[in-house]
Structures are given as structure tokens and as C-alpha cells.
Interface confidence: low
């Protein structure tokens, strides 16, 4: 089975960890894919661990587990993600998580007179 | 001595499974990635996708959905659904492919013809 | 997804001439690369793996260079049985690919 927390939020300038968890008695992950908007943010491979693209890899951090830490969030960010499982011998899960980033409190604080 | 072969039907009707089989010696598949390529008659080469040492498969973009790589003790298997003229190509099996030393070797390759 | 680009596409040289053949990628591939020679009717055979390193059997005429995103294949002096097509390929990824190789350069008699 695959879970997912289905809908997520975080502040703008923030951190977030995207995860799935998936459990199965007979099956063994063997590569995970994070993705975003039809691009890939993240490749697990049981043989040779993580691979980020250099497009996220300044924002991108593998982990923890086989999830994913996304840092410097912003309001573009928000939307739908993708982990994908595949499993030997079952075959593919997936899981999908919604982003949203909220612009930071700091934009809403009105400064008082002294 | 490291060989690879493939082999399978050198006809396949339109809309029909292509099955090719790639038979290893000499070195062991649990250990290996094996890769599919392909190349149309007068084109360049053309990947199909790659399994792992684990049984991970990773098809290329254009195939996901028509194409399944699996594996046994001693062989890979290549199947390609809903062919049409255009899947028509000599199709080759190499050892490697992925973060390894190259694809080495490669297959001789077999022609596969997609026609009614 | 990463494209890999030869060029050119095509080039005639004779017997004895340094041929260069430049392939480039979409990305960075760090030394992810291989080189590949084809002749008609053969499968392909590996000459350069990890962008620099000559595969076993390969005469020493072949070199490779580059890293990250910019990669050369060198034929110092061109023989007779040189006359062939040439394929980069790149291993660095493979998931959300096209194609992992280039489209290749095919070197011609003069």
C-alpha cells in the first residue's frame, strides 16, 4: 500500500519534506522518482542511491529516507507531486501530495509607530 | 567468454506484441545493467530502456506504456506492444548502459520487420 | 530529460588526417559518456568510456576529452578502417529520457 499525507502546506522562504510511505509484505522498492509539473525533481535507484538534476539540486535535498527535504520554497512551488515506487516484483505505486506555499507572515506585518 | 544473442520472430503484424529474447554466457545478470537499443533502417540508435542488477527497469520516453523489460537467470527479455511500421528496426541487447563502464558488449542484433 | 548533440552531422576527411567530433549535452553528465563506433552492418563497439577511457582493444589513436556538459572524440591519424559512424552516448541518467545517445557523425572518404 501507499500513503501520503495528501495535502501539505508550508511558508514561502521555508522547508518542506515530502513524503510516501509504502509497505508491502512481498514487494522491494527498487528505484523512487519524485516529480513535479512533469519534471523530475529526484531519482532513487537501489543501485546507486540518489540522483538530483542540477535545476533543483541547489534547493533539493535527498531524504529522509525516501522522501525528499524541497528548502527555498516559494509561492511557485505549489502544486502537485509525484512519488513514483517501483517495486520487484509488483510493479509501480503512486503516491500524490499538494503543495501549498503560503506567502511568508512577514509580508502581513504592519509596522506600528513608535 | 562474454556473448550475448538475441532472437525472436523477424515478422510482427501491426498492432501485434514484438517479443525478442537476449540469451547472456559469461557473466552473470544479477550483477549487471542490460540495456535495449534499437536501429531503424539508415537511422541512428535508438534506446529502449534498461533493467538493473535488481530488476529496476527505466524505458525511454517514448516507449513507457508499450514497452516491459524483464529478466530471468540467464536471459532479458524485450517486449514492444502495438507495433507499427515505424517499430520496424534491428533491435540489439548490450550489457551496461547506466553510471557503468559503456554498453560492452553488444548483441549482433536482429531484424525485426512490422508488416501486415 | 537530456539531449545529447553531435556535430557535425557528417564530415570527409583522407587517410592521416586528425579528425575531431564534438558532442554536447543538455546537462551536466559530469564524465558520463561513452563513444561508439558503427560500421554497416554491425553492431556497434564501445571505444571511450567515463569521457576519457579507452576500452579495451581500442588502438591509441582514439582519445576522448571533456566533462560536465562538453565532450570531444579524437582520431589523431585517420586509417582506412576508421571510415565508419560515430555515436555518443550518455549514462548519467535514464529515467524521463528520450534518447541517451547523439545522433551521430558519420566520417566519410574524401
Known amino acids: 500500500t501507499m500513503e501520503t499525507k495528501g495535502n501539505i502546506s508550508a511558508e514561502e522562504g521555508g522547508s518542506v519534506v515530502l513524503q510516501c510511505h509504502f509497505s508491502s509484505d512481498t514487494a522491494e522498492v527498487t528505484q523512487v522518482n519524485w516529480e513535479q509539473r512533469d519534471q523530475l525533481l529526484a531519482v532513487y535507484s537501489v543501485d546507486l542511491g540518489w540522483y538530483v538534476p542540477s535545476v533543483f539540486s541547489d534547493r533539493v535535498v535527498p531524504g529522509p529516507s525516501l522522501g525528499l527535504t524541497f528548502q527555498s520554497l516559494t509561492t511557485n512551488d505549489t502544486g502537485e507531486y509525484f512519488c513514483t515506487y517501483h517495486t520487484y516484483p509488483d510493479g509501480i505505486y503512486k503516491g500524490r501530495i499538494f503543495l501549498k506555499v503560503q506567502e511568508s507572515s512577514a509580508h502581513f506585518q504592519i509596522a506600528l509607530p513608535g | 567468454q562474454v556473448q550475448l544473442q538475441e532472437s525472436g520472430p523477424g515478422l510482427v503484424k501491426p498492432s501485434e506484441t514484438l517479443s525478442l529474447t537476449c540469451t547472456v554466457s559469461?557473466?552473470?545478470?544479477?550483477?549487471?545493467?542490460m540495456s535495449w537499443i534499437r536501429q531503424p533502417p539508415g537511422k541512428g540508435l535508438e534506446w529502449i530502456g534498461i533493467?538493473?542488477?535488481?530488476?529496476n527497469t527505466y524505458y525511454a520516453n517514448w516507449a513507457k506504456g508499450r514497452v516491459t523489460i524483464s529478466k530471468s537467470s540467464n536471459q532479458v527479455s524485450l517486449k514492444l506492444s502495438s507495433v507499427t511500421a515505424a517499430d520496424t528496426a534491428v533491435y540489439y541487447c548490450?550489457?551496461?548502459?547506466?553510471?557503468?563502464?559503456?554498453?560492452?558488449?553488444w548483441g549482433q542484433g536482429t531484424l525485426v520487420t512490422v508488416s501486415s | 530529460d537530456i539531449q545529447m548533440t553531435q556535430s557535425p552531422s557528417s564530415l570527409s576527411a583522407s587517410v592521416g588526417d586528425r579528425v575531431t567530433i564534438t558532442c554536447q549535452a543538455s546537462q551536466n553528465i559530469y564524465s558520463d559518456l561513452a563513444w561508439y563506433q558503427q560500421k554497416p552492418g554491425k553492431a556497434p563497439k564501445l571505444l571511450i568510456y567515463r569521457a576519457s577511457t579507452l576500452a579495451s582493444g581500442v588502438p591509441s589513436r582514439f582519445s576522448g576529452s571533456g566533462s560536465g556538459t562538453d565532450f570531444t572524440l579524437t582520431i589523431s591519424s585517420l586509417q582506412p578502417e576508421d571510415f565508419a559512424t560515430y555515436y555518443c552516448q550518455q549514462e548519467h541518467l535514464v529515467a524521463w529520457i528520450y534518447n541517451v545517445f547523439g545522433q551521430g557523425t558519420k566520417v566519410e572518404i574524401k
Open positions: 559469461g557473466f552473470s545478470l544479477s550483477s549487471s545493467y
Open positions: 533493467i538493473g542488477s535488481n530488476g
Open positions: 548490450a550489457r551496461g548502459g547506466y553510471r557503468t563502464s559503456g554498453m560492452d558488449p
